[in-house]
């Protein structure tokens, strides 16, 4: 029900990559302005763009206090020039977003393949370990420090004179590979949680290959 | 505040199997890893293994393969380890665990009261 | 599987410091191990102190504190009171097991 000059929000969506977090819906408004809430389970619920004409809000400085909290976000419609203006229930329309857990669930953002050097037959590949959004003691936190152990990486490399692909896996930010001498490589390499049942896996992070700037060549 | 609730006592014959529960209370369940520790009688702490309730990921000490198994029920925030195949060398405390923080502060920080689990014919 | 190597016994002073090591058979300890150090007294439940190389629990008093010291992780312990008379266990993380070492007993004397 509600006024009639007012339509719930619909499709509620969680839109994050590496806990920077935004919440979408439909639909465009016409007459009509928006607020969001957002709440963990056992919380008090928070207001935050209030009176909007978008379709988003990022609800990013919310979750960052605690990724392992489940949040729940509803959107409020209100008549636009008449944000005082209720339901026939005597309150605004509103819809509930599905229930989200950040450590669970934020995507994996695109990773980077931060150096790579070769000494002899061996090659070191270090990857970036990002900076996020969540803080502690006024600090902002890497991937690895908040994921930790859950966090692997994937690298996949590969003569640059052919396709076949092989991998190689790392708890840390580092991969040890061998390589054949005088043979230039290309390296990709992937965020992975294995432990997840969503969002497992980033995509590829760019290509890079030996012979460019990226890495050095040292040899021994 | 955080709290791992145990089961109580066992007491079981050599081939039987034991379940020992676990309910944890005071944050949000699926998000941390459940570890499970034993400690036979006057002796050291011995890893079992691992889960994580929100995606019922496991991980085992390779001893224990085959025998354990480790089951989480996010309706009512208890995690269970099964141990099958009894014998006298499993009597000891059973422990399950989290840890305190995310990230680089995993491990063993929260610890429940244990179950005494004695093997006997 | 890894062994974790912890000295069997150590004895303190009051007020005195001590530093219990912990090794592993693989090589150098390293952040990616994710040491932990759990402290047990007599008759009592296992305690967690430290966790992640060296990230203190709320319940951890300021006098341990945790670090990787060379090719090792260590638990410092400042002046030492008798209450601190314990076993204290080190668990390191292998890429997909923790393994416990023996445990150091600490005696204030």
């Known amino acids: 029900s509600g006024t009639t000059n007012t339509v719930a929000a619909y499709n509620l969506t969680w839109k994050s990559t590496n806990f920077k977090t935004i919440l979408e819906w439909e639909p465009k408004p016409v007459n009509q302005v928006y607020t969001v809430q957002i709440s963990t389970k056992s919380g008090d619920w928070k207001s935050k763009c209030f009176y909007t004409t978008d379709t988003e809000c990022d609800l990013t400085d919310e979750i960052v206090k605690d990724v392992k909290q489940t949040y729940l976000a509803r959107v409020f419609s209100y008549p636009a020039g008449n944000v005082e203006s209720t339901g026939s229930a005597g309150e605004p329309l509103y819809e509930n977003s599905p229930e989200f857990t950040p450590y669970l669930e934020t995507n994996l953002g695109q990773p980077t393949i931060q150096s790579f050097e070769q000494v002899g037959t061996k090659v070191n590949v270090t990857v970036e370990d990002e900076r996020t959004l969540v803080r502690r003691n006024n600090t902002f936190l890497s991937l690895r420090d908040v994921f930790g152990k859950d966090l692997i990486y994937t690298l996949y490399y590969w003569k640059s004179s052919s396709s076949g692909k092989k991998t190689a896996k790392t708890n840390t930010n580092e991969f040890l590979i061998d390589v054949d001498k005088g043979e230039n490589y290309c390296f990709s390499v992937q965020a992975v949680i294995p432990s997840r049942t969503v969002n497992r896996k980033s995509t590829d992070s760019p290509v890079e290959c030996m012979g460019q700037e990226k890495g050095e060549f040292r040899e021994i | 505040q955080v709290q791992l609730q145990e089961s109580g006592a066992e007491v079981k014959k050599p081939g039987a199997s034991v379940k020992v529960s676990c309910k944890a209370s005071?944050?949000?369940?699926?998000?941390?890893?459940i570890e499970w520790v034993r400690q036979a009688p006057g002796q050291g702490l011995e890893w079992m293994g691992e889960?994580?309730?929100?995606?019922?990921?496991?991980k085992y000490n390779e001893k224990f393969k085959g025998r354990v198994t480790m089951t989480a029920d996010t309706s009512t925030n208890t995690v269970y380890m099964e141990l099958s195949s009894l014998r006298s060398e499993d009597t000891a405390v059973y422990y399950c665990?989290?840890?305190?923080?995310?990230?680089?502060?995993?491990?063993?920080?929260?610890w429940g009261q244990g179950t005494l689990v004695t093997v006997s014919s | 599987q890894a062994v974790v190597t912890q000295e069997p016994s150590l004895t303190v002073s009051p007020g005195g410091t001590v530093t219990l090591t912990c090794r592993s058979s693989?090589?150098?300890?390293?952040?990616?191990?994710?040491a932990n150090w759990v402290q047990q007294k007599p008759g009592q439940l296992p305690k967690g102190l430290i966790s992640?190389?060296?990230n203190r629990g709320p319940w951890t008093t300021a006098r341990f504190s945790g670090s990787i010291l060379g090719d090792k992780a260590v638990l410092t312990l400042w002046g030492a009171h008798t209450e601190d008379e314990a076993v204290y266990y080190c668990?390191?993380?292998?890429?997909?097991?923790?393994?416990f070492g023996g445990g150091t007993k600490l005696t204030v004397l």
């Open positions: 665990a989290r840890d305190y923080y995310y990230g680089s502060s995993y491990g063993f920080a929260y």
């Open positions: 005071g944050y949000t369940f699926s998000s941390y890893w």
């Open positions: 889960i994580l309730p929100g995606s019922a990921s496991t």
């Open positions: 693989t090589g150098a300890v390293t952040t990616s191990n994710y």
């Open positions: 992640g190389t060296n």
């Open positions: 668990a390191l993380w292998y890429s997909n097991h923790w393994v």
